[in-house]
């Protein structure tokens, strides 16, 4: 008789899991010689203690510390790039200026880009048939509560400048409720960080607005500046030729507006 | 119309204790992180304490921790520093001030602190 | 500790005269240095933000320039109610340290 099995709302785990953050965490240890001291089995084995036999609705961070632990990685702290829904453009950035890095480029950030994950209460298995919604089933699932540990974790560690990227085609450019607005604002430690610059990457070709002076930079702008940081905003007109000139600093076109 | 009033000051003997008080009224106080500067009888302006607005967390200069301790009542507006164990070179004047992104936008009118036998 | 240098200590200036305070800080310091004015028996009011930033209700004649180690604050044509005493703040650590101060006094 098959056992009764919760229905979630979201889609279940990533098929072949274990197998992926396993080889992630090889490939990724492989290219970073900072990071060969670790175990990658150490590193599953803490991964899976935070979600297996555990209510996927009743997660915490503190479920999270063994790997947290393991995976405790220095990056520059004024080399920190963080992003709100434009994570492709922000790894296309990263890729080309090899000395900024955003979360997914350190190593636990890197093992869990766009997986889903979740186990049952009471029993070893991983949930490859759905996982819990943040919206509609609970916000203490395993993926919610592992990104909002590791993000945290991430603003707390940046200082001097950091840089936002954020996306001008969305009705909410600073949106409140992302990870960066609800999570990594909030986490900037004023005594370490002297400046936010966010980049607003326009969609539109045509689009020569200021969108700098869009009402959720400017509520953006007061909160960290409540937070003692100073913030300042540059508009990216022409994210391709953005691209290009981080590429080709040389270039002629690169002297005036991107 | 932005205030903030100090009260609490005085003349205290040297390894005395003092309460100051700051009041404040026309912005949301639990919002910023509120400091007190003070400055002393040869006119030097130097930081005491400050508090942080979410988590309430306090910072003081190496000098003074232990003796000095800033609150605050976001519920009722109001700034505190409890100073013990007092020393002659703490007499000064004592603001209350606003932070905003690294500068003091909006300071008291301030309360005057005098150590002395 | 970043030390904030002002001079000179006094300046004695003729009513309309356009004079120059210095702020230099022991190390590089960036844009973050604010200005603050006092006045006798007044608390201090913020002037300029971030070097050379205005503040509204801060009258134009006052300006600053600077970046690195070495600020000025420059003030264009000199009125008697500018007499009193002023502070630069070095922000880049937080937080921050002031000036000794520069007494303007009308002569």
């Known amino acids: 008789v098959p056992r009764w099995r919760q229905q979630w709302s979201g889609p279940g785990t990533t098929k072949r899991f274990p197998e992926t953050v396993l080889a992630r965490c090889v490939k990724y240890t492989e290219i970073h010689p900072e990071m060969r001291h670790v175990d990658c089995q150490s590193v599953w084995d803490a991964f899976k203690g935070a979600f297996i036999s555990k209510h996927p609705c009743n997660i915490t961070e503190e479920d999270y510390q063994p790997l947290m632990k393991l995976g405790t990685q220095t990056v520059p702290c004024n080399k920190i790039l963080l992003w709100s829904r434009i994570k492709d453009l922000a790894h296309q950035f990263t890729q080309v200026q090899r000395d900024m890095f955003t979360l997914e480029d350190t190593l636990l950030g890197y093992l869990a880009d766009d997986l889903t994950w979740c186990g049952e209460f009471n029993t070893s298995k991983i949930n490859y048939q759905s996982c819990p919604d943040w919206r509609k089933d609970c916000s203490n699932n395993p993926v919610s509560v592992f990104w909002k540990t590791v993000s945290r974790r991430f603003a707390e560690a940046a200082c001097d400048v950091v840089h936002v990227m954020l996306n001008g085609s969305r009705s909410k450019i600073f949106d409140k409720n992302s990870t960066f607005g609800s999570v990594e604002v909030h986490n900037l430690q004023p005594e370490k960080v002297q400046t936010l610059e966010a980049w607003v990457i326009h969609g539109g070709r045509e689009d020569s607005r200021d969108l700098c002076q869009d009402p959720t930079i400017k509520e953006l702008e007061s909160i960290i500046s409540k937070r003692n940081i100073q913030f300042s905003c540059k508009n990216i007109y022409r994210p391709d030729k953005f691209l290009q000139c981080v590429k080709n600093p040389e270039d002629s076109s690169c002297t005036s507006e991107i | 119309e932005v205030k903030l009033v100090e009260s609490g000051g005085g003349l205290v003997q040297p390894g005395g204790s003092l309460k100051l008080s700051c009041a404040t009224s026309?912005?949301?106080?639990?919002?910023?992180?509120m400091f007190w500067v003070r400055q002393t009888p040869e006119k030097r302006l130097e930081w005491v304490a400050y508090i942080s607005n979410g988590d309430g967390n306090t910072y003081y200069p190496d000098t003074l921790k232990g003796r000095f301790t800033i609150s605050r009542d976001n519920a009722n507006n109001t700034l505190y520093l409890q100073m013990s164990r007092l020393k002659s070179e703490d007499t000064a004047m004592y603001y209350c001030a606003r932070s905003i992104s690294r500068y003091f936008d909006v300071w008291g009118a301030g309360t005057t602190v005098t150590v002395s036998s | 500790d970043i030390v904030m240098t002002q001079s000179p200590a006094t300046l004695s200036v003729t009513p309309g005269d356009r004079v120059s305070l210095s702020c230099r800080a022991s190390q590089s310091i960036s844009d973050f240095l604010h200005w603050y004015q006092q006045k006798s028996h007044e608390s201090p009011r913020l002037l300029i933000k971030y070097v050379s930033q205005s503040i509204s209700g801060i009258p134009s004649r006052f300006s600053g320039s600077g970046s690195g180690s070495d600020f000025t604050l420059s003030i264009n044509s000199v009125e008697p109610e500018d007499v009193g005493v002023y502070y630069c703040q070095n922000a880049h650590s937080f937080p921050s340290t002031f000036g000794g101060g520069t007494k303007l006094e009308i002569k």
């Open positions: 026309g912005f949301t106080f639990s919002d910023y992180y």
